[in-house]
């Protein structure tokens, strides 16, 4: 006999995990067999929708791979034309393991500002979010809070907040961890120890000391009367984010010296400054004691060696400085007539630059000595044998003139170019032609293999000799 449809197994609420299978069962008794249709949120599910499988004459609805958007009310309706259609409804609750949809990223922040590390999550039940710093759970306090969104907010960021962070999302189905991110706290440059002012005698050495800190570690520059320091040696050391800079000065004039500590924060810089004054006791005294003056070289002996129109230091301890220094060079050059062709041009360059030192004009004209390394090269590479003889004669007082003692500089007492490239003078390039190289210095016993370029012989104004046998 015909029988109206009756749903014998009403639909129940189904819990399903994302990407898993979910099945609703709608068992119907009727005669004839009913047509069963399914809806989700009152919208008909089409039979040919490939995300679903409908079996057992429509009594089983299977969602093949649950998505988080599949949650809602599912209803089955049975109708066979006998009596009215019947309906049963049930809910699909999509359960989801925690997922971090917006993970935290590395952050660089300046001390004192507010930092926010994002951590947006998904999941059902809604995940709770906590944070780990280093290896330990992060404790919230008046400055540090986990927001409703899961993000971490840090007010008034401190140096100790720097470190590695990760967020943890947790619900009954599982736990998700973000990747580890770094919070770097940058600190404006700050001077810890300012240079001290000094009142010193003319010609004394003074060391100015400046210590600064910051993150990143600042660089220290020194300014002399508004310009970059042009003389003096700077020694720096860095320890535990503190930079220590010492400027050693040879005082020939008063000045204002400023230590500037600078560090960079992204595209911006922060600077801190501290200044010290150097005053000279009886500042007028150096004028009386001034040992010389600057003038263009007008002699003959060193014409080929010194640069054209070179400004040289003339020593006023001689009655006639130009005449005396020229005689000094002349005497020394006569001694050089007997030295080897390898040594002679180098020695001539050294002597001329030593006796007629380059001059730095100013309130107090200052002679610029030859750089130690150039002196050593002449002494040890070009003129090893001759130098020993010269030193021996000097010590035994065999030179005719006392003035000749000045003609051999003591290399070890000269300033190094590494200390301050502007505080000493380089010798002109020394360069030989192949034919000049008959002998090698005594420094090495084995004859080295050499590429000697063809070079023009030296011309009038700039003297140019150097041992092609010596690279270093």
């Amino acid at each position: 006999l015909p029988k109206a449809p009756v749903i014998t197994t009403p639909l129940e609420t189904v819990d399903a995990l994302v990407e898993e299978v979910a099945t609703f069962m709608c068992a119907v008794e009727s005669y004839p067999q009913p047509e069963i249709s399914w809806t989700r949120n009152k919208i008909l599910i089409k039979l040919f929708d490939t995300r679903y499988s409908i079996r057992e004459n429509g009594q089983l609805l299977t969602i093949l791979s649950v998505e988080d958007s599949d949650d809602g009310i599912y209803c089955c309706t049975a109708n066979n034309g006998v009596g009215g259609a019947v309906e049963s409804c049930g809910a699909l609750q999509v359960k989801m393991k925690p997922k971090i949809t917006r993970p935290p990223i590395n952050v660089k922040i300046i001390e004192g500002l507010k930092a926010v590390l994002p951590c947006t999550t998904m999941g059902n039940p809604k995940p709770s979010v906590s944070w780990i710093k280093g290896d330990s759970p992060l404790r919230e306090n008046s400055r540090i809070a986990v927001l409703e969104s899961g993000s971490l907010r840090i007010h008034n960021v401190q140096k100790e907040d720097a470190g590695q962070y990760r967020c943890v999302a947790k619900n009954s189905l599982g736990t998700a961890y973000s990747k580890v991110v770094k919070l770097e706290v940058e600190v404006f440059a700050r001077i810890l120890r300012a240079p001290e002012s000094h009142n010193v005698t003319f010609g004394s050495f003074v060391t100015l000391h400046c210590t600064a800190t910051g993150i990143p570690v600042p660089t220290i520059t020194w300014i002399e009367n508004g310009n970059a320091v042009s003389s003096g040696s700077i020694q720096e050391s860095v320890k535990d984010r503190v930079i220590d800079s010492r400027l050693q000065l040879f005082i020939t004039k008063p000045g204002l010296y400023t230590c500037i500590a600078t560090n960079k924060h992204g595209e911006k810089f922060s600077t801190a400054k501290a200044a010290a004054t150097i005053s000279i006791a009886e500042w007028s005294k150096p004028q009386k004691d001034n040992k010389g003056y600057c003038a263009q070289y007008r002699g003959e002996v060193c014409n080929a060696v010194l640069a054209k129109d070179a400004l040289v230091f003339l020593n006023t301890s001689y009655a006639d400085p130009e005449e005396a220094q020229e005689l000094l060079v002349h005497t020394a050059w006569n001694e050089l007539k007997v030295v080897s062709p390898v040594c002679r041009p180098a020695a001539e360059a050294l002597l001329c630059n030593h006796i007629f030192q380059e001059c730095s004009p100013g309130v107090v004209p200052t002679p610029i000595p030859i750089c130690r390394e150039y002196c050593l090269a002449v002494k040890e590479l070009f003129c090893a044998k001759e130098w020993l003889v010269m030193e021996e004669k000097t010590h035994r007082g065999l030179y005719r003139s006392e003035m000749h003692l000045l003609s051999v500089p003591e290399c070890s007492k000269l300033p190094s170019m590494h200390w301050d490239p502007t505080a000493c003078a380089r010798l002109p390039h020394l360069d030989y032609n192949k034919e000049n190289l008959k002998t090698f210095p005594p420094m090495t016993s084995s004859k080295p293999s050499v590429d000697i370029p063809n070079l023009p012989s030296s011309s009038s104004s700039s003297f140019s000799v150097s041992p092609t046998y010596s690279m270093t």
């Epitope: 050593l376 150097s466 041992p467 092609t468």
Partner: antibody, heavy 124, light 107 residues
Amino acid sequence: EVQLVESGGGLVQPGGSLRLSCAASGFTVSSSSIHWVRQAPGKGLEWVASISSSYGSTSYADSVKGRFTISADTSKNTAYLQMNSLRAEDTAVYYCARSEGDRYVSGYFGFDYWGQGTLVTVSS
Amino acid sequence: DIQMTQSPSSLSASVGDRVTITCRASQSVSSAVAWYQQKPGKAPKLLIYSASSLYSGVPSRFSGSRSGTDFTLTISSLQPEDFATYYCQQSGVWLITFGQGTKVEIK
């Protein structure tokens, strides 16, 4: 800021060739001497070659003479080491370094700046 | 060729110790001798040049000296950051040679 950056290292078969580059910044190659120094795995430092490009003067260690060529392109501020007929014993990290001044005086300054090194592996 | 014989090849020392490393040249050399410090995986760093001059930025506990063909590097009071390998280097006429290195280890 003075910087030296080496490149061109890699794996090469015995008998093969490689060209190492040393790009300089913060100073001019023409006013300095440039040197190549190598260090085999677990071993000490070995000087390879030097150039004073203001004169184009070069020198080489006996172990590489005739196989390696050092050169410099002052317009690119770069030094090069062309390595031919490579052998297994050439396997090393190759550093370029600079020293102040021209060739006859540079030794007194020491090698004050070095690159990070580039690894050359010679193996079949 | 000039050989630079460095000794000892390794040494163990404690923080605060005075450490001396020597390089002997096989024949007369110039004072173009330098000392370097190298840490694993890093390029060498210049400490001393011209046999006895301290390079800029290097702590004053490092010093170099010369006696004939013997060159010495001294660390007056060893610090934790000084544990490394040290090399001497002589720059002769067209020939540059390094010592074989001295590894300074923590005792």
